[in-house]
């Protein structure tokens, strides 16, 4: 049961994380005009990975896409690439993890196959989360560098007669969304990897074990219920021994003392 919960929770957390990475990538507010210590303007500038926007105090908002590819800074291209790689890996990870979920039954898929798929999706989520965190961090570093450069020459002009206010940019909402989303995807991936360990079947190569419980002689052959979904209260999926019933999850997760006779 704990394995199913860990796997399910890992899937949900990763799903939220990847949705957040997609949202952050699409958001326009990666950098926003710094309003602190600046003259009060009737225009607010903000920029995303794909376009820059201007919101006037009149309420009118105008956005312009970056229609050039070669004219863009290499760092911005790198951030775009990292975010897209993160999304692609995350999407593939989600697809793989759906089939790996213990609560979903697909034909006669072996537990070992589900374990491998869970591990694969977990690794994909971890890499996806790291890509998003790296992308956002690179952009944030770029902003910090530009911020202090523009602060150094905040006002430029001819002999101080005519001043030009240089627009400074600070962290936008998308950066925080990206960091949180990347972190969630990373956590989800780790949870999937942990769940994978619990899913891997016991490698015990014995044919049969004789049990002697309550005066009854029961011959028990292990490994006969691999196709079980773990859903519901189907009694034929429960193994009865030593006077108690355990589900398949519990048998795999917590081997009884009789397994080592």
């Amino acid at each position: 049961m704990a394995v199913t919960a860990c796997q399910g929770l890992g899937f949900v957390v990763s799903l939220i994380g990847i949705a957040g990475i997609i949202a952050a990538t699409c958001m326009d507010q990666w950098s926003t005009q710094d309003l602190y210590n600046n003259p009060v303007t009737a225009v607010f500038n903000y920029q995303g990975l794909w376009r820059s926007c201007v919101r006037e105090s009149s309420g009118f908002t105008e956005c312009r896409g970056y229609f050039t590819l070669l004219g863009l800074p290499a760092m911005l291209q790198a951030v775009r690439a990292l975010m897209i790689v993160g999304i692609v890996l995350g999407a593939i990870g989600l697809l793989v993890s759906i089939f790996a979920l213990k609560c979903i039954r697909i034909g006669s898929m072996e537990d070992s196959a589900k374990a491998n798929m869970t591990l694969t999706s977990g690794i994909m989520f971890i890499v996806s989360g790291l890509c998003a965190i790296a992308g956002v961090s690179v952009f944030a570093n770029m902003l910090v560098t530009n911020f202090w450069m523009s602060t150094a020459n905040m006002y430029t002009g001819m002999g101080g007669m005519v001043q030009t206010v240089q627009t400074r940019y600070t962290f936008g909402a998308a950066l925080f969304v990206g960091w949180v989303a990347g972190g969630l995807t990373l956590i989800g991936g780790v949870m999937m990897c942990i769940a994978c360990r619990g899913l891997a079947p016991e490698e015990t190569n014995y044919k049969a074990v004789s049990y002697h419980a309550s005066g009854h002689s029961v011959a028990y052959k292990p490994g006969g219920f691999k196709a079980s979904t773990g859903f519901g209260s189907n009694t034929k999926n429960k193994k009865i021994y030593d006077g108690g019933a355990r589900t398949e999850d519990e048998v795999q997760s917590y081997p009884s003392k009789h397994d080592y006779v």
């Epitope: 005009q33 003259p39 009060v40 303007t41 009737a42 225009v43 500038n45 903000y46 920029q47 820059s52 926007c53 201007v54 006037e56 105090s57 009149s58 309420g59 009118f60 105008e62 312009r64 005519v162 001043q163 030009t164 206010v165 240089q166 627009t167």
Partner: antibody, heavy 117, light 113 residues
Framework: EVQLVESGGGLVQPGGSLRLSCAAS????????MSWVRQAPGKGLEWVSS???????YYLDSVKGRFTISRDNAKNSLYLQMNSLRAEDTAVYYC???????????WGQGTLVTVSS | DIVMTQSPDSLAVSLGERATINCKSS????????????LTWYQQKPGQPPKLLIY???TRESGVPDRFSGSGSGTDFTLTISSLQAEDVAVYYC?????????FGQGTKLEIK
């Protein structure tokens, strides 16, 4: 057709108060940024105050703390509460709608405020 | 505060002739985000409220005759009336729409010579 009609102007003594109203028809005021602009007799235009989305307000330094811009969405009206009036506040007060480029495209006919003892 | 200085204070031009009014701001009104200049031109006739002519320094408001044109960038701007008509007699104002307070120029009175 868009119409802005100011009212509430008149003669007031220095230190007195007055509340100007701007009733709009043809537009929903709540969806636009609005401004008050004044013009002293025989003088040029002077921006006084603006209210933008989210109820954020801006004021001319000389009226800050004395004037308050507000709007009533239900009545589709804009207001300018003027307290501690001075002789230099004497002017025709116009309300206007902000447009692209923060330009003022629709103006009322104005209401005269005279501050005199 | 941004100081807007118009020149000349008054101008007399013959009908059909070109009229040019200048406006200079103490700080650049060019927004780097959209490369637009936040300068507006208004026309005010006696006893009337101002009328919007040009915004973003060069964009003509709908309904404004094409003889009116705006140009300039940064701190120096110009309003040009290519062929003066009798109805163009008015006071013209430029306005900074970039920095609060949204200051106006002192106005230029245009008359017929």
């Amino acid at each position: 057709e868009v119409q802005l009609v100011e009212s509430g102007g008149g003669l007031v003594q220095p230190g007195g108060s007055l509340r100007l109203s701007c009733a709009a028809s043809g537009i929903t005021l709540s969806t636009y940024a609005m401004s008050w602009v004044r013009q002293a007799p025989g003088k040029g235009l002077e921006w006084v105050s603006s209210i933008i989305s989210g109820g954020i307000t801006y004021y001319l330094d000389s009226v800050k703390g004395r004037f308050t811009i507000s709007r009533d969405n239900a009545k589709n009206s804009l207001y300018l509460q003027m307290n501690s009036l001075r002789a230099e506040d004497t002017a025709v007060y116009y309300c206007a709608r902000k447009y692209h480029g923060n330009a003022l495209d629709y103006w009322g006919q104005g209401t005269l405020v005279t501050v005199s003892s | 505060d941004i100081v807007m200085t118009q020149s000349p204070d008054s101008l007399a031009v013959s009908l059909g002739e070109r009229a040019t009014i200048n406006c200079k701001s103490s700080q650049s009104l060019l927004n780097s985000g959209n490369q637009r200049n936040y300068l507006t031109w208004y026309q005010q006739k006696p006893g009337q409220p101002p009328k919007l002519l040009i915004y973003w320094a060069s964009t003509r408001e709908s309904g404004v005759p094409d003889r009116f044109s705006g140009s300039g960038s940064g701190t120096d701007f110009t309003l040009t009336i290519s062929s003066l008509q009798a109805e163009d007699v008015a006071v013209y104002y430029c306005q900074n729409n970039y920095f609060y307070p949204l200051t106006f120029g002192q106005g230029t009175k245009l008359e017929i010579k």
